[in-house]
């Protein structure tokens, strides 16, 4: 259950999709990827206050226990709920190849 | 790819499965769950240093960008990779029912 999408901390402060521009050097890919040379990395960033975009029952439990034992149990964390595919042109021993990665760029976020 | 399981921060400091004892009151379930009255909640807790139990390519990217932009990009987070089912005896309008929850207790952890 995707619980409340209203962020009590203020607009843009809670778990959501962000885009971060990164070069191949930034990603540590410069020696095996040829294209694209700049990646618009979509990732999940932001706080997960009580019941905000709770992914499942486990996230709800975590929220409850974090409230009780904040030093022991961390708050839920903002992570990808799904991914977008991305195609890379890679170097190979014989030349180049196109490879699709299905777990590289976040499409949607939730708290868990 | 489940990367290195060696924790560079010392034994037990990195992302792993922990068990937290919780009552129905702790969980906010006292008014709808009859049994069990105490739950051994298994959850994922711990740090996610570089490439430790990286769940996928996205986790690897996140590690790289966190190193470059620690104020913008958070480190990967320790979350369940899979769940164990749990059966609850619940109150219903007509009496009680057994309900299985598949997303309640963490079984295995990774960093994402």
């Amino acid at each position: 259950a995707r619980n409340g999408d209203h962020c009590p901390l203020g607009p843009g402060r809670c778990c959501r999709l962000h885009t971060v521009r990164a070069s191949l050097e930034d990603l540590g890919w410069a020696d095996w990827v040829l294209s694209p040379r700049e990646v618009q990395v979509t990732m999940c960033i932001g706080a997960c206050p009580s019941q905000f975009r709770a992914a499942n029952m486990h996230a709800q439990i975590k929220t409850s226990l974090h409230r009780l034992k904040p030093d022991t149990v961390p708050a839920p964390c903002c992570v990808p709920a799904s991914y977008n595919p991305m195609v890379l042109i890679q170097k190979t021993d014989t030349g180049v190849s196109l490879q699709t990665y299905d777990d590289l760029l976040a499409k949607d976020c939730h708290c868990i | 790819a489940r990367n290195g399981d060696h924790c560079p921060l010392g034994p037990g400091r990195c992302c792993r499965l922990h068990t937290v004892r919780a009552s129905l009151e702790d969980l906010g379930w006292a008014d709808w769950v009859l049994s069990p009255r105490e739950v051994q909640v298994t959850m994922c807790i711990g740090a996610c240093p570089s490439q430790f139990r990286a769940a996928n390519m996205h986790a690897q990217i996140k590690t790289s960008l966190h190193r470059l932009k620690p104020d913008t990009v958070p480190a990967p987070c320790c979350v369940p990779a899979s769940y164990n089912p749990m059966v609850l005896i619940q109150k219903t309008d007509t009496g009680v029912s057994l309900q299985t929850y598949d997303d309640l207790l963490a079984k295995d952890c990774h960093c994402i």
Partner: antibody, heavy 119, light 112 residues
Framework: QVQLVQSGAEVKKPGASVKVSCKAS????EGWYIHWVRQAPGQGLE????????????NHAQKFQGRVTMTRDTSISTAYMELSRLRSDDTAVYYC????????????WGQGTMVTVSS | EIVLTQSPATLSLSPGERATLSCRSS???????????LDWYQQKPGQAPRLLIY???NRAHGIPARFSGSGSGTDFTLTISSLEPEDFAVYYC?????????FGQGTKVEIK
């Protein structure tokens, strides 16, 4: 199969706007960039810009600054290119094409949309 | 912006002959690992362009072996080892080394 299908030919008056659509099928729309290229009658190819369907971010040639808008609707795997304040020298065939990024070759092209600007 | 100059403007040859098309760049298109951000396209009347060669020397999917690309830095060549009747068309080189992406003015390969 993998293809890009564009909207039909348009005839516009100078000063008007035109919006060309490009529907992708047979591949994950958000995994590839959409580029726009035009070709005036009897002339060569001219790159206009790109749209990253994953993020909605765009980039275009300086020549089209303030006149071109590139958008997308991921729910129907369609990219759009709108050109405003049309002039007679905008008469051309407009193509969409896909590439793995901003700097990649265009491996699949739409069939082209003829836009005629005439008073 | 990078200017690409193709020569000759027109090439008159017979089927079975070898075609050599040139593309010269106003600046180097060489990136790391010895790859150049130069591609070749074929266009027939009333049709969209078709990718032949990408990253200076890699044949696109389904392109016959008689097409080959070579060169580095600022000077590039597309070679058609033995012209088939369907090869008579206009050929464009394109650079994606930097924005704006630019094309050469084209070389028309016509039947002698």
């Amino acid at each position: 199969q993998v293809q890009l299908v564009q909207s039909g030919a348009e005839v516009k008056k100078p000063g008007a706007s035109v919006k060309v659509s490009c529907k992708a099928s047979g591949y994950p729309f958000e995994g590839w960039y959409i580029h726009w290229v035009r070709q005036a009658p009897g002339q060569g190819l001219e790159w206009m810009g790109w749209n990253n369907p994953r993020t909605g971010l765009t980039n275009h040639a300086q020549k089209f600054q303030g006149r071109v808008t590139m958008t997308r609707d991921t729910s129907i795997s369609t990219a759009y290119m709108e050109l405003s304040r049309l002039r007679s020298d905008d008469t051309a065939v407009y193509y969409c094409a896909r590439g793995v990024g901003a700097d990649a070759a265009f491996d699949i092209w739409g069939q082209g949309t003829m836009v005629t600007v005439s008073s | 912006e990078i200017v690409l100059t193709q020569s000759p403007a027109t090439l008159s040859l017979s089927p079975g002959e070898r075609a050599t098309l040139s593309c010269r760049s106003s600046q180097s298109l060489l990136w790391k690992h010895g790859y150049n951000y130069l591609d070749w396209y074929q266009q027939k009347p009333g049709q969209a362009p078709r990718l032949l060669i990408y990253l200076d020397r890699n044949r696109a999917h389904g392109i016959p072996a008689r097409f080959s690309g070579s060169g580095s830095g600022t000077d590039f060549t597309l070679t058609i080892s033995s012209l088939e009747p369907e090869d008579f068309a206009v050929y464009y080189c394109m650079q994606s080394f930097e924005t704006p992406i630019t094309f050469g003015q084209g070389t028309k390969v016509e039947i002698k």
